[in-house]
Interface confidence: low
């Protein structure tokens, strides 16, 4: 008997608003393989069972967030596979506050990651660059992490902040600087950046 | 009537691997999973993780994500729990447990003897 | 993770007296709960699986009830051989979690 899961990873990261579809099939030597989704909430997903396979609809709600099993059986011999399933809210809605810096004078840099879910200092960085590298001497403050303000109800949605208190920049001051948000979820890495612009 | 048999007791230093086994006889053993839990002296029980006896597939505790490794030996039907990077809190009695599927729920129906480690300097 | 939190965390009772247990799931969890006996330097001992099934060779007199995030084993005639720890054990979803452990001692 051969049993799969399609796609076959043990976590798959969902964009918020995507939708994924999850097959488990089975066949058997002989006779029918059953084949069911187990450890689903109420919420997570639909479920379509065929004669040896069942397909899991997940449709991009952050409620889909789970652990759903796939349980393929022959008679007496069963076998399983997990899916972790993480949901993810991650727009390109970087906010940078100021504007544009000032050279030759200390500053405080923020910068507001909205909309983002999961809002897990572990799973979401920030980064002040200077090019390619690290600002030098940039003291990164307390983030800070607020629910958004949402127009329907649902799952809260959050913002991050980071601010930097910078030393004052050389001479000559470089042209940007840029504020670099990185989240990492299983087997994937998502970034987005926003420049900042300094006064020449 | 399925039989787990474990291997003996291990006492190793801190930052040491120890690889306990788990033999199994009396049943099919490609169609079970084998889960590995601890308890640690006079504490409750803690799942590690399991594997899945007929196609390797592996799913552990988020805990020990890193530091273990779980593998199996079809020939011989045993399962192996390799754990590494030991420290004193890893002191604790290892059991393998057969997984089996009854009616929609997957108690671990057979348990192993256990096994103890300890992790002393 | 789903916690699950068991409660009394000790109790001292006769032969013969009535013993509840009861165990809270952190989340709902249908009725993918099973409930362990563990003696001093022993395995656990499977007695109940999804919530109310009695395993195979289980004596009687253990029952359980409940679904969703409230579940109950309850021993209806404690007996000199059930004295011991009672865990329960959640498989709805991953990690697999136990309850702290329900240490049941002779009055």
């Known amino acids: 008997q051969s049993f799969q899961v399609n796609p076959p990873e043990s976590e798959v990261a969902v964009a918020m608003g995507t939708s994924l579809q999850i097959t488990c099939s089975m066949s058997c030597d002989e006779g029918v393989a059953r084949v069911h989704w187990r450890g689903l909430d109420t919420s997570l997903g639909s479920v379509q069972t065929l004669p040896g396979s069942s397909i899991l609809s997940v449709r991009g709600m952050l409620s889909d967030t789970g652990t759903p099993v796939c349980v393929g059986s022959c008679g007496s011999r069963s076998f399983q596979h997990s899916v972790k399933i993480l949901v993810y809210a991650f727009p390109d809605q970087l906010v940078v506050s100021p504007e544009f810096l000032v050279p030759g004078q200390d500053q405080v840099v923020s910068c507001t990651a909205h909309n983002i879910w999961p809002a897990d200092p572990n799973s979401l960085s920030f980064a002040l660059l200077l090019g390619e590298q690290r600002l030098e001497g940039a003291q990164a403050l307390e983030p800070e992490q607020e629910e958004e303000i949402q127009e329907a109800e649902g799952t809260p949605l959050f913002r991050m902040t980071q601010r930097w208190r910078l030393p004052s920049l050389g001479t000559p001051a470089p042209p940007a600087l840029h504020c670099q948000v990185t989240m990492q979820l299983p087997k994937l890495v998502l970034t987005h950046r926003k420049e900042i612009p300094v006064l020449q | 009537q399925v039989q787990l048999v474990q291997s003996g007791a291990e006492v190793k230093k801190p930052g040491a691997s120890v690889k306990v086994s788990c033999k199994a006889s009396?049943?099919?053993?490609?169609?079970?999973?084998i889960s590995w839990v601890r308890q640690a002296p006079g504490q409750g029980l803690e799942w590690m993780g399991w594997?899945?006896?007929?196609?390797?597939?592996?799913n552990y505790a988020q805990k020990f994500q890193g530091r273990v490794t779980m593998t199996r030996d079809t020939s011989t039907s045993t399962v192996y729990m390799e754990l590494s990077s030991l420290r004193s809190e890893d002191t604790a009695v290892y059991y393998c447990?057969?997984?089996?599927?009854?009616?929609?729920?997957?108690?671990?129906?057979?348990w192993g003897q256990g096994t103890l480690v300890t992790v002393s300097s | 993770d789903i916690q699950m939190t068991q409660s009394p965390s000790s109790l001292s009772a006769s032969v013969g007296d009535r013993v509840t247990i009861t165990c809270q799931a952190s989340e709902h969890i249908y009725n993918y709960l099973n409930w362990y006996q563990q003696k001093p330097g022993k395995a656990p001992k499977l007695l109940i699986y999804a919530a109310s099934s009695l395993q195979s060779g289980v004596p009687s007199r253990f029952s359980g009830s409940g679904s969703g995030t409230d579940f109950t084993l309850t021993i209806s005639s404690l007996q000199p051989e059930d004295f011991a720890t009672y865990y329960c054990?959640?498989?709805?979803?991953?990690?697999?979690?136990f309850g702290q452990g329900t240490k049941v001692e002779i009055k």
């Open positions: 594997i899945s006896a007929y196609n390797g597939y592996t």
């Open positions: 009396g049943g099919t053993f490609s169609s079970s999973a």
């Open positions: 447990a057969s997984r089996v599927h009854s009616g929609g729920s997957y108690p671990d129906d057979y």
């Open positions: 054990q959640q498989t709805d979803s991953i990690p697999i979690t």
